[in-house]
């Protein structure tokens, strides 16, 4: 049996009061002091079983210094076993022992839950010497107790390599319920059940839980902690909290918002970053995600042309980054572009449509009938061709690019010439004699350089050779050109 000191119970209508037969105290007091001084403590506690010899951790001295009479066994006196008090109160408790004067250098240490209490603790040891024995009172005080002060406190004393251990003094700090698990904010599917958890601890126990949804109590009667609330489904956002009750009162958890997942809002601010002949780089600002992460987006492209069939091209892309390069477009065309994104619930509406245009493209065909012949008198090569049949989308012709490669005895050199769009002939200087010259021509627009014509080769002899026959590419066709000398 243990003696308990306990503060007065504050009745709370929902819950049973203090344990029967227990005492409560919130007083700062010296408990169970066998005082030799005139000080009278506020509360006195007698041992649980007065007169019973204590046979626990005791040191039994062999003999006195004279070697004649035996001394009684050494033991700490019984004191209060259990102190119950509220958080932020002060508490003081003690151990006392009477030690024969033959023992020198006795020290008492305090231990909590098996660990020695060192440093900044308020422990005071007082000595009251008498003729044969010295009464030692070790007191320990805690100001403004906290839950972390809960535990089992003991005194230890070393005498002649023997250790004497006191009965434990159990300190129980009581307060309002303390949450160890609170409900968490969640995003949930409409009309789908989900769970919320609430757990709180004392002391004092029991702790009982009430759930609150949008300010209304869900459970009419308290549920023991921990409590799991299965919410049967929501059609709109709701706020949940839980109330934890014990004999000391009530603690309310944080309120958490439970959101209903929905389709995202449409993206906004679709903008054009770069246009080429066959691609457009766009970006957008994602709309609200509907409380569910975006999965992917869809870029929808319609050609704005009265003659087009109005079909929509759809390009799927990841939701991030919020950018996409639309490819495989026609040059010099107008398009209407919209973006839609999806989450687990579904697709958003399409963003506001924006207009964008591709630039003019490079020519898609090479110049025709390329003819090359040597003008030996002037020491240059004459090149002639026919203007290619380009589509409107390729834009206006701005000129031609001529590539001529000179090959002789393992040496190869490529040169490029640019000529205006009005020309259909050009002359280039002979770079090397006794060599082969290979000529290719490409049409050029603002959109870029088109494909080169098939190569036409002509042999440039050493000085004195005459060659008036031209080399040419057949028009049109893919047959290898013939070199005529």
């Amino acid at each position: 049996a243990i003696t308990e000191a306990r503060e007065e119970a504050k009745p709370y209508p929902l819950f049973p009061g203090p344990l029967p037969g227990s005492l409560q105290t919130d007083h700062t007091s010296l408990l169970s002091l066998p005082h030799t001084s005139g000080y009278q403590p506020a509360l006195m506690f007698s041992p649980t079983q007065p007169g019973r010899p204590y046979t626990g951790n005791v040191a039994i001295p062999r003999v006195t210094s004279a070697g004649s009479k035996l001394l009684p066994p050494l033991a700490f006196k019984h004191t209060v076993g259990h102190i119950i008090l509220s958080e932020h109160k002060d508490v003081k408790f003690n151990c006392s022992i009477s030690v024969p004067n033959i023992y020198q250098d006795t020290t008492i240490s305090w231990w909590k839950d098996g660990k020695e209490l060192l440093g900044a603790h308020h422990a005071i040891t007082q000595f009251y010497p008498d003729d044969e024995v010295t009464a030692i009172i070790a007191s320990f005080s805690i100001t403004s107790v906290q839950r972390s002060d809960n535990g089992s406190y003991i005194c230890k004393m070393k005498i002649n390599n023997e250790e004497i251990v006191s009965d434990p003094i159990y300190i129980e700090v009581q307060g309002l319920p303390h949450f160890t698990k609170q409900p968490e904010s969640m995003n949930v599917t409409r009309n789908t059940a989900f769970n919320l958890t609430c757990q709180a601890v004392g002391p004092p126990e029991p702790v009982n839980i009430f759930w609150v949804q949008n300010s209304s109590r869900v459970n009419e009667q308290p549920e023991k902690s921990p409590s799991v609330l299965t919410v049967p489904g929501l059609t709109e956002m709701a706020v949940f909290s839980c109330e934890a009750h014990n004999d000391k009162g009530l603690t309310v958890s944080k309120g958490v918002q439970i959101n209903i997942k929905a389709i995202p809002s449409p993206p906004t601010e679709v903008s054009i970053h770069n246009s080429t002949a066959h691609s457009i780089l766009i970006s957008w600002v994602p709309g609200f995600d509907g409380y569910s992460p975006f999965r992917n987006c869809s870029v929808q492209v319609k050609e704005v042309d009265p003659l087009s069939n109005g079909s929509v091209m759809i390009f799927n892309t990841s939701a991030s980054p919020h950018m996409y390069q639309i490819k495989q477009l026609q040059a010099l065309a107008n398009y209407s572009i919209g973006v839609s994104c999806m989450n687990e619930i579904g697709w958003s509406a399409v963003s506001p449509w924006i207009l964008a245009s591709t630039t003019e493209g490079a020519p898609s065909v090479a110049p025709l009938n390329v003819t090359v012949f040597l003008n030996e008198s002037r020491d240059n090569v004459d090149i002639r061709w026919m203007k290619p049949l380009t589509k409107r989308q390729a834009g206006e012709l701005v000129g031609y690019r001529i590539s001529h490669v000179w090959q002789s005895a393992g040496i190869s050199k490529e040169l490029l010439e640019e000529v205006g769009q009005n020309n259909s002939r050009a002359q280039i200087s002979v770079q090397v004699h006794n060599a082969t010259c290979t000529v290719r021509i490409a049409a050029v627009t603002k959109g870029g350089v088109g494909p080169f014509s098939d190569p036409v080769k002509i042999f440039i002899p050493a000085h004195g050779w005459v060659d008036h026959a031209p080399s040419s590419t057949p028009a049109p066709g893919n047959a290898d050109p013939v070199l005529i000398i």
Partner: antibody, heavy 118, light 106 residues
């Protein structure tokens, strides 16, 4: 299994009192509230209120204060409805029901017919 | 208090037909419960919290709704479904019931 068993029919004179019992079994009585519902002949259901079986605290709906008293004997897992100063208009079937979360009445007693007639 | 209005008061249908019962609340409520009552019997729980079937209730019963408008649907009436149906709100005290809808055989 969960059961709510109500006392038998009562025939009372105006001005008398009646006490209807509702004995619960198959669950921990003090974990769930007990609701009382009235149904007058040929009429719909009318919620009278409930009693907290953990604290014994009753809650009465408007129109059921004064002459109506909810009580408990937790030792025998029983809830009681007492009506005093009976009137002819108190003639009805009185049901007890177990209250679950969200005030859902998940189990019902079989009902007790109280007839008030001179 | 929240007043619950059930409509229609009486619904005359044949077995196999679809029954749609309405319950309107005078102000918004989070959940609606539904009960079935046959003559001389206690009410029987049917639907918990708007759309959850009570144990042992067949899948032809379903509930839906939110705010102030709730519906109980019986997809194909069986002979044993002809009864009176009551809605009951959860959100605020007192815990009110609707006036009931009687589903009778046509």
């Amino acid at each position: 299994q969960v059961q709510l068993v109500q006392s038998g029919s009562e025939l009372k004179k105006p001005g008398a009192s009646v006490k209807v019992s509702c004995k619960a079994s198959g669950y921990t009585f003090t974990n769930y509230g007990v609701h009382w519902v009235r149904q007058a002949p040929g009429q719909g259901l009318e919620w009278m209120g409930w009693i907290n079986t953990y604290t014994g605290e009753p809650t009465y709906a408007q129109g059921f204060t004064g002459r109506f008293v909810f009580s408990l004997d937790t030792s025998v897992s029983t809830a009681y409805l007492q009506i005093s100063s009976l009137k002819a208009e108190d003639t009805a079937v009185y049901y007890c029901a177990r209250g679950y979360r969200y005030a859902y009445m998940d189990y019902w007693g079989q009902g007790t017919l109280v007839t008030v007639s001179s | 208090e929240i007043v619950l209005t059930q409509s229609p008061a009486t619904l005359s249908l044949s077995p196999g037909e679809r029954a749609t019962l309405s319950c309107r609340a005078s102000s918004s409520t989070s959940y609606m419960h539904w009960y079935q009552q046959k003559p001389g019997q206690a009410p029987r729980p049917l639907i918990y919290a708007t759309s959850n079937l009570a144990s042992g209730i067949p899948a032809r019963f379903s509930g839906s709704g939110s705010g102030t408008s709730y519906t109980l649907t019986i997809s194909s009436l069986e002979p044993e479904d002809f009864a009176v149906y009551y809605c009951q709100q959860w959100s605020s005290n007192p815990r009110t019931f609707g006036g009931g809808t009687k589903v009778e055989i046509k």
